[in-house]
């Protein structure tokens, strides 16, 4: 389970307030850090182990997910054809 936490607010600029947000995730046994719907998430460790990245549903709703060659990451393809690539180190 993950929740979005507001860490601090930048009040040095009076005309706008900048909030810095981060995810705080508590994973269950058998889960580790991953990405689901383009957000931090706890995912089945077996997905990470086998590098079947698309099984964690990393792309936004309506986008297509494809594995990169050698399973080094994944691509998310938007309906308009724009591609976002994520590589895993």
């Amino acid at each position: 389970t993950c929740e979005i936490v507001t860490l601090d607010r930048d009040s040095s600029q009076p005309r706008r307030t900048i909030a810095r947000q981060t995810a705080r995730c508590a994973c269950r046994k058998g889960q580790i850090a991953g990405t689901t719907r383009a957000r931090p998430a706890c995912v089945d460790a077996r997905i990470i182990k086998t590098k079947q990245w698309c099984d964690m549903l990393p792309c936004l709703e309506g986008e297509g997910c494809d594995l990169l060659i050698n399973r080094s990451g994944w691509t998310c393809t938007q309906p308009g054809g724009r591609i976002k690539t994520t590589t895993v180190s």
Partner: antibody, heavy 129, light 103 residues
Framework: AVTLDESGGGLQTPGGALRLSCSAS????????MFWVRQAPGKGLEYVSE????????NYGSAVKGRATISRDNGQSTLYLQMNSLRAEDTGTYFC??????????????????????WGHGTEVIVSS | ALTQPSSVSANPGETAKITCSGG???YGWFQQKPGSALVTVIY???ERPSDIPSRFSGALSGSTNTLTITGVQAEDEADYYC???????????FGAGTTLTVL
Amino acid sequence: AVTLDESGGGLQTPGGALRLSCSASGFDFSSHGMFWVRQAPGKGLEYVSEITNDGSGTNYGSAVKGRATISRDNGQSTLYLQMNSLRAEDTGTYFCARSNYACPGGFSCWGDTGQIDAWGHGTEVIVSS
Amino acid sequence: ALTQPSSVSANPGETAKITCSGGVYSYGWFQQKPGSALVTVIYWDDERPSDIPSRFSGALSGSTNTLTITGVQAEDEADYYCGTEDISGTAGVFGAGTTLTVL
């Protein structure tokens, strides 16, 4: 190099208490789930307890549940095991162990016994009157 | 409880296999020689620490993990424990240990 150094063992009396420590170095301690595992003389390994990387979650083996408390100080890179109401069956060598997976910032992760990749040399505990 | 054989024997140069079943998530293999510290030879099913010889390998098939030592050497004689999570997935568990004898 990853180093785990246990201390705090020794001769204890039945019904007494002890606190074991494990000093870690050579890695980012706060990112890893940690374990205590013990071994009675001439016997196999027994799961004692574990703690998540950030200390928010703990778990215990049935033999020590209710008598043991695992904790950690990430600032000091130290793992602890408090054992109360000691019994003769608690006699053995207590090992500190690290789970390999490095949990990223913002996440709280459990270790996995199958992912233990580093062990301490152990500290011997003898419970006897 | 995990199931692993109590003993396995092999001649030098032969291949020794030790199986472990009955757990969930991932499996590890831990070597213990008399009077020596525990050494992880395999973790997360098939990962080998950098200082462990390549003759050690692990493979997962279903819920059974097999430790294979290809080209057994005299110094491999030791007790080998498998470790994983119990079937409930809530606590760690270890096998009773397998004694590898090099004939």
